[in-house]
């Protein structure tokens, strides 16, 4: 639990930018939580660099991260989930840089899954449903979801709908007929916990039907 590097220590190391960011995932593996950190500069030479978290832990002072390629990772049950922890980049037992972070404010939910779209001919709409593992969790239960969809040919023209449930209805009249659409969804904590958007779910593709004219209706 050493403090910050003193002036004159590790002179070469101090020339580098050791800025880093982290995200937590709660109950990601049963009752185990995880914390993942990475350097913001992908070119940082991570040889001999270690990450350590101290404080706001259950019955231990500090925990060391495991290194997996360019990311640093902890899986544990020992997060108090209140107050700030001190997360430090260390070399040879000396801290190069530290950040005080409340792990409940950097939560990244798991990506939604089982996204599907069903067309209801009678209702002239599309029912979008998806699933999230967070419905079964004790902590990060309340999420805001972002459903994004686009016509496949419009590469950057995404439409977004925010919702708190896992079901959305898209009206046929608001979509182009006889078109291929791509749809995907992601989630962010929305109560007590704060943090980041999850990864996107795998995309689902669906085609809209052609417009059926009502009997007696004339083509223009």
């Amino acid at each position: 639990e050493s403090g910050y590097a003193q002036n004159g220590d590790l002179e070469d190391a101090e020339l580098d930018d050791y800025s880093f960011s982290c995200y937590s995932q709660l109950e990601v593996n049963g009752s185990q939580h995880s914390l993942t950190c990475a350097f913001e500069d992908p070119d940082v030479n991570t040889t001999n660099l270690e990450f350590e978290i101290c404080g706001a832990l259950v019955e231990v002072k500090c925990l060391s991260f495991r290194k997996l390629q360019e990311i640093y990772f902890i899986e544990t049950k020992k997060f108090l989930l209140i107050g700030k922890s001190n997360i430090c980049v260390k070399v040879g037992g000396k801290s190069l840089t530290c950040k005080k972070i409340d792990l409940t404010t950097i939560v990244k939910p798991e990506a939604p899954f089982d996204l599907s779209v069903i067309y209801r001919e009678g209702a002239n709409d599309f029912v979008v449903t998806f699933n999230t593992s967070h419905l079964q969790k004790k902590y990060v239960k309340v999420l805001m979801h972002d459903v994004a969809y686009r016509q496949e040919k419009d590469e950057n023209k995404w439409m977004h709908v925010n919702l708190s449930s896992t079901k959305l209805t898209l009206l046929q009249r608001n979509l182009q007929p006889e078109a291929m659409y791509e749809i995907k969804v992601r989630s962010i904590p929305d109560h007590y916990f704060k943090g980041f958007w999850s990864e996107w779910s795998p995309s689902y593709y669906f085609r809209t039907p052609e417009i059926n004219n009502s009997p007696g209706e004339m083509d223009p």
Partner: antibody, heavy 119, light 105 residues
Framework: QVQLVQSGAEVKKPGASVKVSCKAS????????MNWVRQAPGQGLEWMGL????????SYNQKFKGRVTLTRDTSISTAYMELSRLRSDDTAVYYC????????????WGQGTTVTVSS | EIVLTQSPATLSLSPGERATLSCSAS?????MHWYQQKPGQAPRPLIY???KLASGIPARFSGSGSGTDFTLTISSLEPEDFAVYYC????????FGGGTKVEIK
Amino acid sequence: QVQLVQSGAEVKKPGASVKVSCKASGYTFTGYTMNWVRQAPGQGLEWMGLINPYNGVTSYNQKFKGRVTLTRDTSISTAYMELSRLRSDDTAVYYCARGDGNYWYFDVWGQGTTVTVSS
Amino acid sequence: EIVLTQSPATLSLSPGERATLSCSASSSVTYMHWYQQKPGQAPRPLIYEISKLASGIPARFSGSGSGTDFTLTISSLEPEDFAVYYCQEWNYPYTFGGGTKVEIK
């Protein structure tokens, strides 16, 4: 104002248990840890354990683990400390103290509860 | 477990004098806090995170140090400053030092 009010003095026999309460007011109870610190007559301060009122997660000083149990009732913003298998050297003043989670110091203290263990 | 040793155990000074209290840790500590306790009262926070003044604490109190050696200084003792002072490490198991009693000479 922020306040912690503890239950009254207790006299117990060796081998018995004692349960001390600490009622919080003036702040969001679930936003801070509740710590328990004891002080034997003429002695220094000794941290016993803490509870996160939001989720009930506890962290104990190994010296007391197995003998101390921390609980809380969020509906009445009250924390409890139960110490079992009492011995004469458990005679002390027991304090609850709010933990400031930004800096991990005890920023608000209860008035203390005197527990006397005597046969 | 880190052991915090406070010295001196007792400091006999007169009002208006400067008091320097030491807290030595058996291994490196990132942050240290200080509390004041008067007879029959609960402790009250004085200094947190080495040098930050707790709410309502007068500026004659200051803290400094790093690593294993920390100091609480009272620049000019007032009559109400005669009490016992404790240092405490910020991390589990939140160990306190044995205390320094500042008494009137």
